[in-house]
């Protein structure tokens, strides 16, 4: 089973947010087929997605293990309708992906205002918190669980009528803020790790949320 | 390296208008968040105003409010302060500055070398 | 707004005093207060973070604490080259507050 006419994978790239995570490669197959290989760097190697000819594999399964540890991945081409045979020698054509360090590299999800309490001139803003399929002990972890306090939420809150964005942080899931009585509040919120200084320190905002819709109660 | 300069700076009349430029090297401002800050001659520091460069919000102090406007142009990876309808009190030099986190409290890391306003007739 | 009131104004002192500079907050910011240093004709420069924390490159002779709503910054034996201005700033909330600054002459 000869590897003639196989190209070799290219422009390997990690997609990953909130640990959900997924190698993705070029070139669209023409009569070939592809393998994915993974390992941690002291590993052996695994392999997923057997014989796809799909462009993109995912391997949240294999980083969930141990988010902290750093991952390489390579894909390997095969011939269209290729069988593993026992007496095959040659080493089909294969490319390296970059390393990837799940627990520095994924990137925050869009966060969520769960809800919002307004309580005389003081409102309690809740972030959700979202699940990983990360585990411990056979049971999923939250981003806060993994992350702990180097996950931070930046809140950015406004009144109704004025454009300008006032701030606050938490090392929790919850913000308490001064209001002004009387005043309607929006709100926005951002989950930022600050001990990372790369570009994907900071996820998108989430949707902005209004006092005076359904999300949440105000209580004199 | 890390560095922010500003630009832009000069002899301005009562009523007129001047923008300011902060370019940044050594880090990417969408990650950060940018401040400007004032200081009139003989004075203390006056906080100014910021933008998260991410998003386009800004705040800003009351006695620039509705005159000044922070803008952020990430693919430049410059920060801006358009100043309008500028007083004699809005003589100082003006620094735009990093904001960065340890956990959830705030700093300034990196100042610019400060640029002169001045507004005079 | 938070006020942040530093005192004193000025102060002289020679080569190898101990000093201190201390910043009372208008209300709670728990530990979100950072000193900067300034000499004239140039920029502030960081020196302490989150009330306590020696910023990269700072001298170990400065130190910053916190006791409620007091910020203090000590200059545990003073250099040539700390003779300069000093400013707390409050970034707990929306406005940033700096304090008035503490100019540190030499005696």
């Known amino acids: 089973s000869g590897t003639t006419n196989t190209v070799a994978a290219y422009n390997l790239t990690w997609k990953s947010t909130n640990f959900k995570t997924i190698l993705e490669w070029e070139p669209k197959p023409i009569n070939q087929v592809y393998t994915v290989q993974i390992s941690t760097k002291s590993g052996d190697w695994k392999s997923k997605c057997f014989y796809t000819a799909d462009t993109e594999c995912d391997l949240t399964d294999e980083i969930v293990k141990d988010v902290k540890q750093t991952y390489l991945a390579r894909v390997f081409s095969y011939p269209a309708g290729h069988v593993e045979s026992t007496g095959s020698t040659e080493e089909p054509p294969y490319e390296n992906s970059p390393e990837f360090t799940p627990y520095l590299e994924t990137n925050l999800g869009q966060p969520t205002i769960q809800s919002f309490e307004q309580v005389g001139t003081k409102v309690n803003v809740t972030v959700q918190d979202e699940w990983t399929l990360v585990r411990r002990n056979d049971t999923f972890l939250s981003l806060r669980d993994v992350f702990g306090k180097d996950l931070i939420y930046t809140l950015y809150y406004w009144k109704s009528s004025s454009s300008g964005k006032k701030t606050a942080k938490t090392n929790t899931n919850e913000f308490l803020i001064d209001v002004d009585k009387g005043e309607n509040y929006c709100f926005s919120v951002q989950a930022v790790i600050p001990s990372r200084r790369t570009a994907n320190r900071k996820s998108t905002d989430s949707p902005v949320e209004c006092m005076g819709h359904e999300k949440g109660e105000s209580r004199e | 390296e890390v560095q922010l300069v500003e630009s832009g700076g000069g002899l301005v009349q009562p009523g007129g208008s001047l923008r300011l430029s902060c370019a940044a090297s050594?880090?990417?401002?969408?990650?950060?968040?940018i401040h400007w800050v004032r200081q009139a001659p003989g004075k203390g520091l006056e906080w100014v105003g910021y933008?998260?460069?991410?998003?386009?919000?800004?705040y800003y102090a009351d006695s620039v409010k509705g005159r000044f406007t922070i803008s952020a142009d990430t693919s430049k990876n410059t920060a801006y302060l358009q100043m309008n309808s500028l007083r004699a009190e809005d003589t100082a030099v003006y620094y735009c500055?990093?904001?960065?986190?340890?956990?959830?409290?705030?700093?300034?890391?990196?100042w610019g070398q400060g640029t002169l306003v001045t507004v005079s007739s | 707004d938070i006020q942040m009131t530093q005192s004193p104004s000025s102060l002289s002192a020679s080569v190898g005093d101990r000093v201190t500079i201390t910043c009372r907050a208008s209300?709670?910011?728990?530990?979100?207060v950072a000193w900067y240093q300034q000499k004239p004709g140039k920029a502030p420069k960081l020196l302490i973070y989150?009330?306590?924390f020696l910023y990269s490159g700072v001298p170990s002779r400065f130190s910053g604490s916190r006791s409620g709503t007091d910020f203090t910054l000590t200059i545990s034996s003073l250099q040539p080259e700390d003779f300069a201005t000093y400013y707390c700033?409050?970034?707990?909330?929306?406005?940033?507050?700096f304090g008035q600054g503490t100019k540190v002459e030499i005696k």
């Open positions: 500055a990093r904001a960065d986190y340890y956990y959830v409290d705030e700093y300034w890391d990196y």
């Open positions: 933008i998260d460069p991410s998003n386009g919000y800004t």
């Open positions: 700033q409050q970034h707990y909330t929306t406005p940033p507050t």
């Open positions: 050594g880090f990417t401002i969408g990650s950060y968040w």
């Open positions: 209300q709670d910011v728990n530990t979100a």
């Open positions: 989150s009330a306590s």
